[in-house]
């Protein structure tokens, strides 16, 4: 049903009124305001911004706006003892040192408290040794090195280029390979798009630019010292030795000028193939160690960062629902940045601010949403999704009973080519219907819908005439809501053309050059893409909070479950002999998917026909829809990842950013041919099929008629 049937509705107070109130000029103004100084988590500046947002959300008209604080483990460089990397000669003299910080961008020369590039949560240490170049440090890169090239990384310092996978996975892989240190760098092949100038004359990364970022492997734990529970005033904290996800070897990031100096001397093995070569004028030799004349020189890391328990602040705003105040639709994005946060996160925070202002305007005119909307400005996302996770841990009982949906609102843009959406299949139809009603901001699509330009530029690989919608992975604040609590979640932003731009993310990601001017001059001068993202995110929240029947279609889940079952079966069928030997069958899973499909179809028919004027039946049907995502949660979690509990989706074990389907089965099958005990390994595959089949069947039954 249309949103117009929601409460206290007048013709003026519908989705159109909400969308019409969103203004590009306001988003621009808010972005400027949020990006003039750094807002690093745990700093006074970020606390002041939290209080400013609290005050402004109250002025905008929310019913209440509170700060929720937690004391979590953060990481900072030592101000008097900077981190750097050296090349040392045989006498131990430092003959080359990497930069201590990035040259500041024009207009920001006198800004204080710019944190120098560092890898958050790196342990202290001064390892020295030979260098090994490990490409992107992916699982497959280490397989290539160790299995094919017979290169041993044990006791070596490895240098890896950023890109392809989450940096924490790189560090974990290096640790498992026995490395004693990791140097991360941005290669121009990944962070310098051809034909574009470097900042401040374009959106490319200068040679002195460096990507900051955390290197944790939290697997959804939140604060490393209080996994599973909020880091509140009476929290019991683990000792640092028992903390979750901390790296055990020193790690440090550098730019491509400094990387050139390290890589140009590399000797040893040649790169195995062209996929290991970047764009620097170096041989990309793997090592170990330097070539001929330089073979006595070593690399030494000097890392002095410290881990500190520090107070962080979320801002939580409430717009109470008129009919179902105990049903929560959440819009959340983070506020903390590495430096200025021109894109990450403030392009998202500015959009949230304008969405709150628009909802507040409607509320001041007498309107209320049907369901409660919660708005969140999360802290310490950059340090491991800490603010959102701690708040969700503190409120988990409420959320698991009342949480309808979570819409994430980090960076609004990572390009200006087309829309990018990742969400639960329950939201596919909502996103399709909404984007058909919105105007495309794209050149050449004047007067056309957003759906049309999106579908043209980013077509679905499976369904013609439909746009691509991706699986949710992690690396952002939806993680705890979706992967741990099973609350239907989605995210949307404008993105680049992935076909022509092969670089990873956007070039200036997490560097000092991510400024307001970067956005205003190069990405979105008219802020029309920001406005479109505001309309998508805000429109989704509006519909989720206001539709009489929740805008979820369970049939879309049935479709993807079949696709995922086919995919995982195909992977398993690469081992036909073992499947036969160990009696591995997917029959139970396919049967459960078939049952789910049939039950979902019948449920959808009932959804069309039931008496929507009966509040009890309406609530019952909506609850079945709301709790469907919850039904995919296994309370025991995935093996060795207790906070990843969704059986259908989890962040890839090899790349936190990517989503994996049927992750339990996938991980059990991964590299199974190398397992020392095949019987045990295939037994785990069978167990995971059983868990998946049971879960799908159990979820299907939540959609059956209740009696």
């Amino acid at each position: 049903k249309s949103s117009n049937e929601a409460t206290n509705i007048t013709p003026k107070h519908n989705m159109k009124a909400f969308l019409d109130e969103l203004k590009a000029e306001n988003i621009k103004k808010f972005l400027y305001n949020f990006t003039q100084i750094p807002h690093l988590a745990g700093t006074e500046q970020n606390f002041q911004l939290a209080k400013q947002i609290q005050s402004q959300w109250k002025e905008f008209g929310l019913d209440s706006v509170e700060l929720a604080h937690y004391d979590v483990l953060l990481s900072y460089p030592n101000k008097t003892h900077p981190n750097y990397i050296s090349i040392i000669n045989e006498d131990g003299n430092e003959i080359f040192n990497t930069s201590l910080f990035e040259p500041p961008p024009p207009g920001y020369e006198n800004v204080s408290d710019i944190v120098p590039p560092f890898s958050a949560f790196s342990p202290q240490g001064m390892p020295e040794g030979d260098l090994v170049y490990v490409n992107y440090a992916r699982t497959e890169d280490f397989f290539k090195l160790e299995r094919d090239m017979k290169i041993n990384c044990s006791g070596k310092i490895v240098i890896a280029r950023y890109g392809k996978v989450f940096r924490g996975n790189k560090v974990k892989n290096a640790q498992l390979a026995g490395a004693k240190g990791v140097i991360l760098y941005s290669d121009p092949a990944d962070y310098f798009a051809p034909g574009v100038k470097s900042y401040p004359d374009g959106w490319n990364l200068p040679g002195g630019g460096v990507q900051r970022g955390n290197i944790l492997n939290l697997n959804g734990a939140g604060d490393p010292l209080t996994p599973g529970y909020p880091a509140n005033e009476y929290a019991y904290r683990r000792g640092i030795a028992e903390a979750v996800g901390l790296p055990s070897i020193p790690v440090h990031p550098i730019g491509y000028y400094d990387a050139q100096k390290l890589l140009e001397k590399m000797g040893g093995s040649a790169p195995p193939d062209s996929s290991w070569r970047g764009s620097l004028k170096v041989p990309y030799n793997v090592g170990p160690g330097f070539t001929g004349n330089f073979s006595t020189q070593k690399v030494k890391m000097h890392i002095h960062s410290t881990n500190e328990v520090t107070r962080i602040y979320n801002v939580i705003g409430t717009l109470r629902g008129a009919v179902e105040p105990d049903r929560y639709v959440i819009l959340g994005g983070h506020r903390d940045s590495w430096v200025f946060g021109g894109i990450d996160p403030q392009s998202g925070a500015a959009v949230v601010h304008e969405i709150v202002r628009s909802f507040g305007t409607l509320k001041k005119e007498g309107w209320r949403p049907r369901r409660t909307i919660l708005f969140a400005s999360w802290d310490a996302e950059e340090f491991g999704l800490l603010g959102s996770t701690e708040w969700a841990e503190e409120n988990s009982r409420l959320l698991q009973e009342r949480g309808v949906a979570y819409i994430n609102a980090d960076s609004s843009i990572e390009g200006n080519y087309t829309l990018r959406v990742d969400c639960t299949p329950l939201m596919y139809s909502l996103v399709h219907n909404l984007t058909k009603e919105l105007k495309s901001p794209d050149e050449g699509f004047e007067g056309k819908s957003l759906y049309e330009s999106w579908t043209k530029k980013s077509p679905s690989p499976e369904f013609s005439g439909m746009p691509r919608i991706s699986k949710l992975g992690s690396g952002n604040d939806f993680e705890v809501f979706f992967q741990r609590l099973g609350i239907a979640s989605g995210r949307a932003r404008y993105t680049k053309n992935w076909e022509t731009n092969k670089f990873s993310g956007y070039p200036l990601y997490h560097s000092v050059y991510e400024t307001y001017e970067l956005v205003e001059k190069f990405y979105d001068p008219m802020f029309k893409y920001h406005l479109t993202v505001a309309q998508v995110r805000g429109g989704m929240v509006f519909e989720l909070a206001n539709s009489i029947v929740l805008p979820f279609d369970c049939r879309d889940y049935a479709v993807v479950l079949r696709k995922y079952a086919d995919k995982i079966y195909s992977i398993s069928m690469k081992h036909p002999q073992e499947m036969k030997t160990y009696s591995v069958s997917f029959d139970s899973l396919f049967s459960a998917v078939k049952n789910f499909t049939e039950i979902a179809s019948k449920f959808s028919e009932r959804l069309q026909d039931f008496d929507k004027s009966n509040p009890i039946v309406l609530r019952m049907m909506n609850d079945q829809l709301m709790f469907l995502e919850r039904a995919f949660i296994d309370p025991l979690g995935l093996p060795d990842r207790p906070f990843y509990r969704h059986v259908i989706y989890a962040p890839s074990s090899h790349n936190k950013y990517a989503g994996e389907s049927f992750p339990g089965i996938y991980d059990a099958l991964f590299d199974i041919e190398s397992k020392v005990d095949p019987s045990k390994a295939w037994g785990e595959v069978k167990r995971q099929i059983y868990v998946a089949a049971f879960t799908v069947q159990a979820a299907a039954e939540t959609l059956s008629e209740v009696a």
Epitope: S99, L100, F101, P103, P106, P200, D201, P206, K261
Partner: antibody, heavy 120, light 106 residues
Amino acid sequence: EVQLVESGGGLVQPGGSMRLSCAASGFTFSDYYMAWVRQAPGKGLEWIANINYDGSNTYYADSLKGRFTISRDNSKNTLYLQMNSLRAEDTAVYYCARNWDGYYGYFDVWGQGTTVTVSS
Amino acid sequence: DIQLTQSPSSLSASVGDRVTITCRASSSVSHIYWYQQKPGKAPKPWIYRTSNLASGVPSRFSGSGSGTDYTLTISSLQPEDFATYYCQQYHTYPPTFGQGTKLEIK
């Protein structure tokens, strides 16, 4: 051969104006930031101004802002420095220089310099 | 603005001597550049990004340092090395130069 040749120097009275030119050859002019640097007699080097690839952004030493204007004509491979309200302390050798790496570059190619004398 | 102070301002040395010129910044910079200038001539780029020798610069020259303290070293002074050397920072606008170190024959 990469070359920068300055011209336009000479004697000028205090309060007067002068325009210096720098002709570039041997490289793709529009691919580089350019700069002016000066050196007073018997003194050290002083950066005056920078200009980006297409002339859309200019950067000046605070002490000279408002009196000096840097510009370029990429079609003529020429850099300019317009100097107004000249003072005796502006007497110096003026060098045109190429920035090696955009905004953050250093000066990797220098002209031979042109002498400006401000005197009555 | 970042001030660069070179020491010594002038230095008398003999052919074959090892010579070190220092450049101290008023606040931390990521790199220093060095130029050589001979009388009546334009400066020449000599060392870039602290430790990289410009094209044609002999290997007896080396550069090192980080933060606020940088050095240019000549391992064995040759007759053609007598000149004035300037350090420069291009880290924080505006670009600034040291006052110069004049290297003279003893």
